[in-house]
C-alpha cells in the first residue's frame, strides 16, 4: 500500500521536517530556516512563531516543531499556548484598564494575577469572623459563639481560595 | 493543504455594520493567529486585526473602535465585524494565515470586495 | 507605527534581467534574536497576496530560489537575479517585528 501510494503522491515519502518542493521535481527539501514541517508529506513548511515583544522563548524551533513562548518578567501568560501576555500586579490588586488598582475594601487578591474577590461572609455558614480580612487575604472564619465550649476546636480552616477564569484582555 | 475562504455580502449601506467570516479548511484553526487585511481598489494593503484560536485578539489602532473579530472552533471560522462604515471602508478583504501575531502571513484567502455605497 | 518606504515604485525590466527593491523601515526592524521582522509579498494582477521571504532573508518554502533577501536593521533589499514574466506584480515589504504590522507602499514590476 505505501509503494502504491508513493507512485501516486511523490510527496507522501518526504518526512517531518522537510517539504515536498515543486521547483525541484517534487523532491523532499529540508524545511528551510525558521521553518518547520510537524507532519510527513507536506508541501510547504510552516513559519516558525517569534516570541517578540513581551513573549520570550519557551521552547526553540526546530525543523519538526514549532516554538512556544511564555511571558518576560513582570507578565504572565493568558490564553492557550500563552497567546497573550497580561501584566502582573501586587497581592491585593487587580488589573483594570487603567493599570493595577487596589482591591476595595471587602475584597482581596492574594495573587499577582486574577481579580479582587469578596471576602467569605463568615456568617453564611453560621460562623463568626476570627482574623479580619486584608487586601491580600481573605477572612478566617472561626465557630459560631454557641459552637465555642471547652474542648472544641477554635479554628475552622478557610475553604481553599478558587482562581477565576480569565477572559483574555 | 489549508485553505481560506472569505464570505459574506458585496454591498454594504453606510452607517451599517459589515461582516465577513473566512472559513479554513485543510487544517485546525487551532495554534494560530488569523488575520484580517484589507486593500481598498487600486492601493496598498492594510492589517486590520488578529485572534487566536483561544479567543484573544488584537486590533490596528486607527480602527479598534470598530471592529470585532471573533472565533468559532468547532465550525473551523473566524469573522470580522466592522461597524459604522463609510465608503472609506469599501476594499478587497482578505483573512490570512498569521504565524507570529502580526507577521509572515503565510497562507491567504482569495479576498471579497465590499463595497459601501447607499 | 513604524513606517515603511519602498524604491522604486515602478521598475520595468527585461525578462531574463535582474531586478532589485529597496525597503526602508523609520526604526530597526533587528530583534534581541537576531531576527530581522521582515517580510517580502509579491501580489500577482487578480491575485492575493504571497509570500516570498521571511525573516529578512529566508525564502519561503516553494519559492523558486532567483528571488533573495538581504538587509538588516532598517534597510533591506529584495532581488531577483533573472526576471520571468511570471514574476509581474506589486512587491509589498512588510514589518512583523510591532503591531500594528505596516506594509510599505508597493512596487510595480512590469516586462519591457
Known amino acids: 500500500f505505501e509503494r502504491t501510494r508513493s507512485l501516486q503522491d511523490p510527496c507522501s515519502n518526504c518526512p517531518a521536517g522537510t517539504f515536498c518542493d515543486n521547483n525541484r521535481n517534487q523532491i523532499c527539501s529540508p524545511c528551510p530556516p525558521n521553518s518547520f514541517s510537524s507532519a510527513g508529506g507536506q508541501r510547504t513548511c510552516d513559519i516558525c512563531r517569534q516570541c517578540k515583544g513581551v513573549f520570550r522563548t519557551r521552547k526553540e524551533c526546530s525543523s519538526t516543531s514549532n516554538a512556544e513562548c511564555d511571558c518576560t518578567p513582570g507578565f504572565h501568560c493568558l490564553g492557550a499556548g500563552c497567546s497573550m501576555c497580561e501584566q502582573d500586579c501586587k497581592q491585593g490588586q487587580e488589573l483594570t484598564k487603567k493599570g493595577c488598582k487596589d482591591c476595595c475594601f471587602g475584597t482581596f487578591n492574594d495573587q499577582k494575577r486574577g481579580i479582587c474577590r469578596p471576602w467569605t461572609n463568615c456568617s453564611l455558614d453560621g460562623k463568626s469572623v476570627l482574623v479580619n480580612g486584608t487586601k491580600e487575604r481573605d477572612v478566617v472564619c472561626g465557630p459560631s459563639p454557641a459552637d465555642l465550649s471547652p474542648g472544641a476546636s477554635s479554628v475552622t480552616p478557610p475553604a481553599p481560595a478558587r482562581e477565576p477564569g480569565h477572559s483574555p484582555q | 493543504q489549508v485553505q481560506l475562504q472569505e464570505s459574506g455580502p458585496g454591498l454594504v449601506k453606510p452607517s451599517e455594520t459589515l461582516s465577513l467570516t473566512c472559513t479554513v479548511s485543510g487544517g485546525s484553526i487551532s495554534s494560530y493567529y488569523w488575520s484580517w487585511i484589507r486593500q481598498p481598489p487600486g492601493k496598498g494593503l492594510e492589517w486590520i486585526g488578529y485572534?487566536?484560536?483561544?479567543?484573544?485578539?488584537n486590533y490596528n489602532p486607527s480602527l479598534k473602535s470598530r471592529v470585532t473579530i471573533s472565533v468559532d472552533t468547532s465550525k473551523n471560522q473566524f469573522s470580522l465585524k466592522l461597524s459604522s462604515v463609510t465608503a472609506a471602508d469599501t476594499a478587497v478583504y482578505y483573512c490570512?494565515?498569521?504565524?507570529?501575531?502580526?507577521?509572515?502571513?503565510?497562507?491567504w484567502g482569495q479576498g471579497t470586495l465590499v463595497t459601501v455605497s447607499s | 507605527e513604524i513606517v515603511m518606504t519602498q524604491s522604486p515604485l515602478s521598475l520595468p525590466v527585461t525578462p531574463g534581467e535582474p531586478a532589485s527593491i529597496s525597503c526602508r523601515s523609520s526604526?530597526?526592524?533587528?530583534?534581541?534574536?537576531?531576527?530581522?521582522?521582515l517580510d517580502w509579498y509579491l501580489q500577482k494582477p487578480g491575485q492575493s497576496p504571497q509570500l516570498l521571504i521571511y525573516?529578512?532573508?529566508n525564502r519561503a518554502s516553494g519559492v523558486p530560489d532567483r528571488f533573495s533577501g538581504s538587509g538588516s536593521g532598517t534597510d533591506f533589499t529584495l532581488k531577483i537575479s533573472r526576471v520571468e514574466a511570471e514574476d509581474v506584480g506589486v512587491y509589498y515589504c512588510m514589518q512583523a517585528l510591532q503591531t500594528p504590522p505596516t506594509f510599505g507602499q508597493g512596487t510595480k514590476l512590469e516586462i519591457k
Open positions: 485572534i487566536y484560536y483561544s479567543g484573544s485578539t
Open positions: 525573516a529578512g532573508s
Open positions: 490570512a494565515r498569521d504565524q507570529s501575531g502580526g507577521g509572515s502571513f503565510q497562507h
Open positions: 526604526q530597526s526592524l533587528l530583534y534581541s534574536n537576531a531576527y530581522n521582522h
